[in-house]
């Protein structure tokens, strides 16, 4: 049944579709963008973790307009996937429960079998999601790829595709700042360089506050990493912009250690102002 | 290393004026002072050791009044820009890092009750 | 053997919770959708959920979200269903039943005995 | 959610009539992937219900060949040729097309 007049089962199951998606709910998934290449995924590893693989499989006639040549009922339909160390499966998941198909893993979960349907009838599609742990990707992992075939007891010739990804380590660091006043205001006299003692004489004060926040791990193992501030300190033709009085890191250093920044700010030995002492 | 990308250039180039008296409001130009068109930058770089949640960098600096008295008496408003960044220096090859640098403009204006004082 | 072995009859004060089992026996526990039904007494059926032994994902009906938790053990073969803060509303006969499989089996084709909850203060 | 409206509520029959209920969906019963996902079950007086008949015309293994079912789209029937005394008890239609499931009020089949 479901053969054709030969009574041969010719399947023509495809790989319609197949690609790495982030996982935004237990069954909504969002494609990762891909690489310049349109081939391969970019996954960036900032504390996702697991990382969908959307499968659409169909058993359609390869040509429409001699649909009895294949595309026969595919018995025994299964999808084989072979997973990275780095990638664990964890769970299938369907936008439709009646498209979910029985995915089985051995015991270290890097080899899965997934039933189509027995059997997986002639003019069927389904979609559903790998759900896969990331928990194996280190530092050092630069690429995920994973094995699919597809296979059935019906006559077709089957062979292997590859999804890949390139992993990149985001790092999940953000920044802002504010300055205390926002507006200033210039007046009083023209006086010299030479003639400045204390920092009252210079002009307005100005405090600059830049946050950086680090959500996920600590940064530490993974490079040496630093905070940089441009700071206009002359105009064009070489004269004082904003000049540079004390400059304070608290944080990144370790607990109740303040940081030393370079170069040394108030280059012209300025008093301080005593309300800032 | 994975640090920002030069600041664009501001679309115009003010010269600083070279007269300091008096200009009508409706002369006045809005100028921008931004590294490295407009201004020239000195970068103070911090090291970050032991980074678990937050940094806090603070600066204290001061205008140099001389300078704009001389230089920006005929210009309406001054937009100072002050720019911060993160960089990441790792054997990593693989290391991205988004959001990471920030931009905080001060705009100065010459004091409306200032007497100026040649 | 019985396929899907309820737990007994509970008689639970309003607001304390209820947990019931469904032992399943005789076929592979992940290989089917785990689904409960709630009957109150001369009524008709109400869907509660479903729940998928191989993975737990669950799938409830939105009129349950709040009151129904559908949880297994593949260690023991056994679903569970917890009902929280029950009312008088909630006393009534909950089945486990057995769905399928990969668009085949949307009925439920094994049911356990029925597990009697009475609510009453 | 998709109502089932199921009629009568009571039907009396002799033993060895033919007995019809009838079961009538708020929307199509026809899913996406071609199926029609309307099952038919039997609830005997102090039991649990039991399957009789899947996607709308498959009778379940053991289920004997005076049942029968039909329909389309939103409209089905259950037909019985030859009622018989175990025949006797509580029938649901119900759908699992939509979210969620849903079954029909229940048909009581009883001895006139």
């Known amino acids: 049944q479901g053969c054709g007049q030969d009574k041969i089962c010719q399947s023509n199951l495809q790989l319609e579709r197949y690609q790495f998606c982030s996982r935004i709910s237990d069954t909504e998934f969002q494609a990762l963008p891909m690489d310049l290449d349109g081939r391969t995924a970019l996954f960036a590893l900032s504390g996702q973790p697991f990382i969908g693989l959307e499968l659409t499989v169909t058993n359609l006639p390869s040509d429409p307009s001699r649909p009895q040549a294949d595309g026969d009922d595919a018995h025994e339909a299964q999808l084989l996937v072979t997973l990275p160390a780095s990638l664990r499966y964890s769970g299938v998941r369907a936008l439709d429960s009646v498209e979910k198909p029985l995915c089985l893993s051995n015991d270290s979960a890097s080899h899965v079998e997934c039933e189509l349907g027995n059997p997986m009838k002639r003019g069927a599609q389904v979609t559903f999601y790998l759900i896969l742990s990331t928990s194996g990707i280190t530092i050092e992992t630069t690429e995920l790829e994973v094995k699919l075939l597809l296979a059935t007891i019906s006559e077709q010739e089957l062979d292997p595709v590859s999804v890949r990804a390139h992993v990149f380590i985001e790092l999940p660091l953000s920044i802002s700042g504010v300055a205390t006043p926002q507006q200033l205001f210039f007046s009083g006299e023209v006086k010299g360089e030479s003639a400045m003692r204390s920092e009252r004489e210079l002009g307005r004060k100005v405090k600059y506050e830049v946050t950086v926040s680090n959500q996920g791990q600590s940064l530490n193992t993974l490079g040496s990493a630093n905070l940089n501030i441009m700071w206009p300190h002359e105009i064009a033709n070489g004269k004082w912009l904003l000049y540079p009085m004390r400059v304070e890191l608290e944080g990144g250093q370790g607990p109740g250690k303040r940081g030393i920044c370079s170069p040394r700010p108030n280059i012209l030995q300025l008093d301080v102002d005593s309300r800032d002492r | 290393e994975l640090g920002q990308p030069e600041p664009q250039e501001p679309p115009e180039k003010v010269e600083p004026s070279t007269s300091w008296w008096p200009v009508s409001s409706a002369e006045k130009r809005n100028m921008t002072l931004d590294c490295p068109r407009t201004a020239k930058c000195v970068v103070f770089s911090c090291p970050l050791y032991s980074f678990d949640r937050a940094a806090v960098l603070h600066v204290w600096g001061r205008l140099w009044n001389s300078t704009f008295l001389e230089e920006y008496m005929a210009v309406k408003s001054l937009e100072v820009i002050v720019r911060a960044n993160i960089t990441v220096k790792s054997s990593i090859k693989n290391l991205l890092l988004r959001d990471a640098s920030t931009v905080i403009p001060v705009m100065v204006y010459l004091d409306p009750m200032a007497v100026v004082v040649e | 053997q019985v396929p899907l072995q309820q737990s007994g009859p509970q008689l639970v004060r309003p607001g304390a919770s209820v947990k019931i089992s469904c032992k399943a026996s005789?076929?592979?526990?992940?290989?089917?959708?785990m689904h409960w039904v709630k009957q109150r007494p001369g009524q008709g059926l109400d869907w509660i959920g479903k729940i998928d032994p191989s993975d737990s994902e669950t799938r409830l009906n939105q009129e349950f979200r709040d009151k129904a938790t559908l949880t297994v053990d593949k260690s023991s073969s056994t679903a569970y269903l917890q009902l929280s803060s029950p009312t008088s509303e909630d006393s009534a006969v909950y089945y486990c039943?057995?769905?399928?499989?990969f668009g085949e089996g949307w009925y439920f084709d094994v049911w356990g005995a029925g597990t009697t909850v009475t609510v009453s203060s | 959610d998709v109502v089932m409206t199921q009629i009568p509520l009571s039907l009396p029959v002799s033993l060895g009539d033919q007995a019809s209920i009838s079961c009538r969906s708020s929307q199509s019963l026809v899913h996406r992937n071609g199926n029609t996902y309307l099952h038919w079950y039997l609830q005997k007086p102090g039991q649990s219900p039991k399957l009789l008949i899947y996607?709308?015309?498959n009778r379940f293994s053991g289920v004997p060949d005076r049942f029968s079912g039909s329909g389309s789209g939103t409209d089905f029937t259950l037909k019985i040729s030859r009622v018989e005394a175990e025949d006797l008890g509580v029938y649901f239609c119900s759908q699992s097309t939509h979210v969620p499931w849903t079954f029909g009020g229940g048909t009581k089949l009883e001895i006139k």
């Open positions: 005789g076929y592979s526990f992940t290989r089917y959708w």
């Open positions: 996607k709308v015309s």
């Open positions: 039943a057995r769905g399928g499989y």
